[in-house]
């Protein structure tokens, strides 16, 4: 039960995280104009990964896309790449994890296959979350550097000329959305990996026939794992898997522990 809950929760958390990463990537407010020096401006600037916007007090907002690719700073391109990689990995991870969910039965898919898929999706979520966090952090670092450079320019001037135009930018809402979303995706991925450990077949399973006081016969599958009857054995709450595939009738005839999870 705990494994399914962990897996399900990991999926939901990752889903929210990836939705957040997508939202952050699309948002225009990665950097917003710092109003410290001019709190009464009638024009407010903010920038995203794809376009820059100007909002006037009247409510009018004008946005311009970055139509050049080569003219953009390398750091911005890197951030874009990290966020897109994060989204792609996250989307693939979600797709894989849907099929890996314990509560969803797909044909005669073995639990070992589901465990592998859970691990794969978990790793994908972790990498996706790290990509988002890295992307947002690189952008934040870029902002901090530019902020202090422009602050210095305000007072010292450039090349002996005092600059009259100095628009400083500070952290926008998208950065916080990105950090939180990346963190959630990362947590979701870790949860999926933890769930995988619970789903995976134990290496220390008994290779011999186990005897029970009950009258139920025990199927012995040579070279495989012990098939649990669901009675008496497995007292340590371990998941035990059949070495071979079972039919639906067998599942109903001989209920095993994982059928109730």
């Amino acid at each position: 039960m705990a494994v399914t809950a962990c897996q399900g929760l990991g999926f939901v958390v990752s889903l929210i995280g990836i939705a957040g990463i997508i939202a952050a990537t699309c948002m225009d407010q990665w950097s917003t104009q710092d109003l410290y020096n001019n709190p009464v401006t009638a024009v407010f600037n903010y920038q995203g990964l794809w376009r820059s916007c100007v909002r006037e007090s009247s409510g009018f907002t004008e946005c311009r896309g970055y139509f050049t690719l080569l003219g953009l700073p390398a750091m911005l391109q890197a951030v874009r790449a990290l966020m897109i990689v994060g989204i792609v990995l996250g989307a693939i991870g979600l797709l894989v994890s849907i099929f890996a969910l314990k509560c969803i039965r797909i044909g005669s898919m073995e639990d070992s296959a589901k465990a592998n898929m859970t691990l794969t999706s978990g790793i994908m979520f972790i990498v996706s979350g790290l990509c988002a966090i890295a992307g947002v952090s690189v952008f934040a670092n870029m902002l901090v550097t530019n902020f202090w450079m422009s602050t210095a320019n305000m007072y010292t001037g450039m090349g002996g000329m005092v600059q009259t135009v100095q628009t400083r930018y500070t952290f926008g809402a998208a950065l916080f959305v990105g950090w939180v979303a990346g963190g959630l995706t990362l947590i979701g991925g870790v949860m999926m990996c933890i769930a995988c450990r619970g789903l995976a077949p134990e290496e220390t399973n008994y290779k011999a026939v186990s005897y029970h006081a009950s009258g139920h016969s025990v199927a012995y599958k040579p070279g495989g794992f012990k098939a649990s009857t669901g009675f008496g054995s497995n007292t340590k709450n371990k998941k035990i898997y059949d070495g071979g595939a079972r039919t639906e009738d067998e599942v109903q005839s001989y209920p095993s522990k994982h059928d109730y999870v």
Epitope: T41, A42, N45, V54, E56, S58, R64, T167
Partner: antibody, heavy 116, light 113 residues
Framework: QVQLKESGPGLVAPSQSLSITCTVS????????VHWVRQPPGKGLEWLGV???????NYNIALMSRLSISKDNSKSQVFLKMNSLQTDDTAMYYC??????????WGQGTSVTVSS | DIVMTQSPSSLTVTAGEKVTMTCKSS????????????LTWYQQKPGQPPKLLIY???TRESGVPDRFTGSGSGTDFTLTISILQAEDLAVYYC?????????FGSGTKLEIK
């Protein structure tokens, strides 16, 4: 067509308050802001404040303490209220429609004289 | 507050001449985000309310004759009337609409000889 018309008391006693109404037609106050500007006799223009479509306002800091701008969208009216008037508040008061922070349509103005 | 300084304060010219008046702001009116200068020019004829001539320093308002041209960027702006006509007798004001409070220049009074 777009029209703005100011209506005021004309004469106000010193230390009294002033109330002017700007009635607009041809546009909605939910879509456009309205500025207030005054002009003392023979002098230049002075911006008083603005009320935006959402109802938020910006004022001239020098007059902020005694100035208030409000509106009634359904009646298409904007109100200017100024307290503690002095003789140097004698001016022609105009309301003007905002368009991208510029004032594209102006009312004819209402003359206000502060005198005892 | 941004201080707007207009020069000359008055100008007497003959019809048909080219007229140039300047406006200086104490701070830049150029917005980096959209590369627009938030400076507006108004014309006020005697006994009338002001009329919008030019916004964003160089964009002519619809219906304004093309003899009126606005130019400049940052802190220095110019209004040019290429061929002065009798009906251009007025006071011309520049206005900062970038930062509150929106401030007007003291005006340039245009008189015809």
């Amino acid at each position: 067509q777009v029209q703005l018309k100011e209506s005021g008391p004309g004469l106000v006693a010193p230390s009294q308050s002033l109330s002017i109404t700007c009635t607009v037609s041809g546009f909605s106050l939910t879509s456009y802001g309205v500025h207030w500007v005054r002009q003392p006799p023979g002098k230049g223009l002075e911006w008083l404040g603005v009320i935006w479509p959402g109802g938020n306002t910006n004022y001239n800091i020098a007059l902020m303490s005694r100035l208030s701008i409000s509106k009634d969208n359904s009646k298409s009216q904007v109100f200017l209220k100024m307290n503690s008037l002095q003789t140097d508040d004698t001016a022609m008061y105009y309301c003007a429609r905002d368009r991208r922070l510029a004032m594209d349509y102006w009312g004819q103005g209402t003359s206000v004289t502060v005198s005892s | 507050d941004i201080v707007m300084t207009q020069s000359p304060s008055s100008l007497t010219v003959t019809a048909g001449e080219k007229v140039t008046m300047t406006c200086k702001s104490s701070q830049s009116l150029l917005n980096i985000g959209n590369q627009k200068n938030y400076l507006t020019w108004y014309q006020q004829k005697p006994g009338q309310p002001p009329k919008l001539l030019i916004y964003w320093a160089s964009t002519r308002e619809s219906g304004v004759p093309d003899r009126f041209t606005g130019s400049g960027s940052g802190t220095d702006f110019t209004l040019t009337i290429s061929i002065l006509q009798a009906e251009d007798l007025a006071v011309y004001y520049c206005q900062n609409d970038y930062s509150y409070p929106f401030t007007f220049g003291s005006g340039t009074k245009l008189e015809i000889k």
